[in-house]
Amino acid sequence: KESCDVQLYIKRQSEHSILAGDPFELECPVKYCANRPHVTWCKLNGTTCVKLEDRQTSWKEEKNISFFILHFEPVLPNDNGSYRCSANFQSNLIESHSTTLYVTDVKSASERPSKDEMASRPWLLYR
């Protein structure tokens, strides 16, 4: 018999490399049975996780799983860091593993490496 506990499916040590200026959606996969739990996102600051109160979030429902999405509109360089989602379910608090965003800030076209440089050292774009 399948468990009806709420489960948050963020993999341990998951990470995303993203670019400043782009839109991005950070997904928290949530499995539940009857009533959808109340889910929040927080950002790790040392040992505490600061709740993200005023950020745009949404739900995406799929057949066997739902996703609680944190929207970055757009990604800013200071969005770099680790995030965690938490679910409140029947007075229980369930916390996910943390997921880390590595944000690269590409400054301007004048700093873009040449095609030759890119061919030999493609990581230059992400300095």
């Epitope: 670019l19 400043a20 200026g21 782009d22 839109p23 509109e73 757009p74 800013l76 360089p77 200071n78 690269t104 800030d105 590409v106 400054k107 301007s108 076209a109 004048s110 873009r112 774009l125 992400y126």
Partner: antibody
Amino acid sequence: QITLKESGPTLVKPTQTLTLTCTFSGFSLSTPAVGVGWIRQPPGKALEWLALEFWTGDKRYSPSLKSRLTITKDTSKNQVVLTMTNMDPVDTATYYCTHKLGMNYFDYWGQGTLVTVSS
Amino acid sequence: DIQMTQSPSSVSASVGDRVTITCRASQGISSWLAWYQQKPGKAPKLLIYAASGLQSGVPSRFSGSGSGTDFTLTISSLQPEDFATYYCQQANSFPFTFGPGTKVDIK
């Protein structure tokens, strides 16, 4: 070097649909961090951001005009097309195509094309 | 949407003058602000990005400062080619918004 050029009608009638094409060179819209956008400027007035297509395929629009705007890219032709439905005389403006890399500052601009909406 | 305001709306100055233009955001935008220069009949040109970063090819007499809600563009010694309209733009969040512009003309 990076260049962008706008093309399309200079005169459209009210209620018609405007289609503007931005043809660019010197970069690819499939390169990480790149975006191509549209900004307009009514005569004697300030700049207004309309839409932006990102290298990822994501698109963002000005909320006040979202229902009327569509931005599409043709990476193989190095073109981005903006369509704007239900044109009105208040949409009379110079329309600029712009390039961005990284954070959303517009570092290269086309020369602009003046679109007049009149019957 | 974040509203951007600029002051003054116009300024009359002479060659060699120091000119300061301010831009204010209706909410905090950290340092995600750009400044553009526009001459009549021409497209805008990016001068400053990230509040204080000088765009390549822009003369060093242009400088930007500020963070949060209050920003400044300074032209240390006005040159004849600097007579133009200047706009600020926030890049902190969609939709990107511009200030109403500041016209710098000859005294």
